[in-house]
Interface confidence: low
């Protein structure tokens, strides 16, 4: 079973709902850890979650709590939570099996559904989490070999491979 | 009864639930009808409906239907459907009671709070609405009638002449 | 809303007032300055359009009271020239809404124009 | 021109209390009462003639259309002692009533 993996409830089937619900451009700031997007998750995951909830946090902030149904403030609330156990999670298993990356994350904007993209794809880094064998894959380099990622696009680092 | 009241329906009660579901920081574009600011709603509202029905209709395409509860997407299409009502009650009533600016409409930028506030005054102009007995209160001049205007100064008039 | 600039003046003198603005997008409301003499009612003195193209006055201040804004700052001004005891009064800003007339008014800012 | 009555009136907490504004010319629903306490900003409680101010206590009410307006407070209470003024805003100048004083009998 993935590190973490049972922080991580069925919440974020909502994100469906939110990204409808909100203006497709609309922009939302993430601190994006470089390499995300060609490196293995244990490279970044420990470094984006801490992002992410930053991100949430200043999200929810932008809506106000109305009791009624699946608001956006619910959801993104309980997003938030999520994503606050993870970051406690990580802290446990900061000395074990996961990276922090050497470089400053870079603040970006992100429509919702980039953001949210990069948001799913992190929450299912700690679904399919393995142990790590080696270091030496956390280096991000030019000749990385189009088997190792081939649906990466290195034009655009900030677009994500689809996500599964 | 107002003009047009009839075509006031409850849904602008949703209202508050869209504006709770907005993003605070996230802005509306809207062509704001110069003289809204300090002349009475029967020199703007035909001009402003049509705005706000130009607005809403852009907002809407910004959100995903989904068919799930009061989503955004189904409040705004409830909204540009009162709002366009409107627009036609005002076609019908264009050559009686209410006026139309010279001024062209500057685009602004409204958060969703101060955008509704705007939607909502703007239907409660309806609501309220009495018939205009004259036409000189939709000019801000000095060569109004002495009982109303002999203490007033006006360096640039805020509007042309209204149309009839 | 909240203004500054008052004090004491002689007759003749001349004062400007600023009404620093925040919570609300400023460049899309009309604001006015409206004074309250001691003891007395309240008097509307001035009025500015959004976009500050547009000023209007009292004939009691006109030629004298200039008002002006900028919106980059989110300040209202008011700039009163050749002052006489009659201005005497608590100056006032007021946002002024589409409907609600003078919803938000500032604590006000005592000018007192004596020799 | 705005004309208030009375200027002046004394009434205990509880009481009804009915202030009333006149306008020299029809100005319509353009009409705002505010309430002014010593020493403070006055605050709207009323605008178009009737419709309440957010986060205005519901006792306070207003009626009225073309020239004849009124102010009403259901029951008194402490905190409403103060001056009620009305204001109209047709076209220019914005002009204000002299005021109402509600005192405490």
């Known amino acids: 079973e993935g590190i973490c993996r049972n922080r991580v409830t069925n919440n974020v089937k909502d994100v469906t709902k939110l990204v409808a619900n909100l203006p497709k451009d609309y922009m939302i700031t993430l601190k994006y850890v470089p390499g995300m997007d060609v490196l293995p998750s244990h490279c970044w995951i420990s470094e984006m979650v801490v992002q992410l909830s930053d991100s949430l946090t200043d999200l929810l902030d932008k809506f106000s709590n109305i009791s009624e149904g699946l608001s956006n403030y619910s959801i993104i609330d309980k997003l938030v939570n999520i994503v606050d156990d993870l970051v406690e999670c990580v802290k446990e298993n900061s000395s074990k099996d996961l990276k922090k990356s050497f470089k400053s994350p870079e603040p970006r904007l992100f429509t919702p559904e980039e953001f949210f993209r990069i948001f799913n794809r992190s929450i299912d880094a700690f679904k399919d989490f393995v142990v790590a064998s080696e270091t030496s894959d956390c280096v991000v380099s030019s000749t990385l070999s189009p088997e190792k990622d081939s649906r990466v696009s290195v034009t655009k680092p900030f677009m994500l491979p689809p996500v599964a | 009864e107002g003009i047009c009241r009839n075509r006031v329906t409850n849904n602008v009660k949703d209202v508050t639930k869209l504006v709770a579901n907005l993003p605070k920081d996230y802005m509306i574009t809207l062509k704001y009808v110069p003289g809204m600011d300090v002349l009475p709603s029967h020199c703007w509202i035909s001009e402003m409906v049509v705005q706000l029905s130009d607005s809403l209709t852009d907002l809407l395409d910004k959100f995903s239907n989904i068919s799930e509860g009061l989503s955004n997407y189904s409040i705004i299409d409830k909204l540009v459907n009162i709002v366009d009502d409107l627009v036609e009650c005002v076609k019908e009533n264009s050559s009686k009671d209410l006026k139309k600016s010279f001024k062209s409409p500057e685009p602004r930028l409204f958060t969703p709070e101060e955008f509704f506030r705007i939607f909502n005054r703007s239907i409660d102009a309806f609501k309220d609405f009495v018939v205009a007995s004259e036409t000189s209160d939709c000019v801000v001049s000095s060569t109004l009638s002495p009982e109303k205007d002999s203490r007033v100064s006006v360096t640039k008039p805020f509007m042309l002449p209204p149309v009839a | 809303l909240v203004e500054s600039g008052g004090g004491l003046v002689q007759p003749g003198g001349s004062l400007r007032l600023s009404c620093a603005a925040s919570?609300?997008?400023?460049?899309?409301?009309?604001m006015s300055w409206v004074r309250q003499a001691p003891g007395k009612g309240l008097e509307w003195v001035s009025a500015?359009?959004?976009?500050?193209?547009?000023?209007y006055y009292a004939d009691s201040v006109k030629g004298r009271f200039t008002i002006s804004r900028d919106n980059s700052k989110n300040t209202l001004y008011l700039q009163m020239n050749s002052l006489r005891a009659e201005d005497t009064a608590v100056y006032y800003c007021a946002r002024r809404d589409f409907f609600a007339h003078f919803d938000v008014w500032g604590q006000g800012t005592l000018v007192t124009v004596s020799s | 021109q705005m004309t208030q009555s009375p200027s002046s009136l004394s009434a205990s907490v509880g009481d009804r209390v009915t202030i009333t504004c006149r306008a020299s010319?029809?100005?319509?629903?353009?009409l705002g009462w505010y309430q002014q306490k010593p020493g403070k900003a006055p605050k709207l409680l009323i605008y178009?003639?009737?419709s309440l101010q957010s986060g205005v206590p519901s006792r306070f009410s207003g009626s009225g259309s073309g020239t004849d307006f009124t102010l009403t407070i259901s029951s008194l209470q402490p905190e409403d002692f103060a001056t009620y003024y009305c204001?109209?805003?047709?076209?220019?100048?914005?002009?204000f009533g002299q005021g109402t004083k509600v005192e405490i009998k």
């Open positions: 919570g609300f997008t400023f460049s899309s409301y009309a």
């Open positions: 500015i359009s959004g976009s500050g193209g547009s000023t």
């Open positions: 204001g109209e805003w047709l076209s220019m100048p914005y002009t």
């Open positions: 178009s003639a009737s």
């Open positions: 010319q029809g100005i319509r629903g353009y």
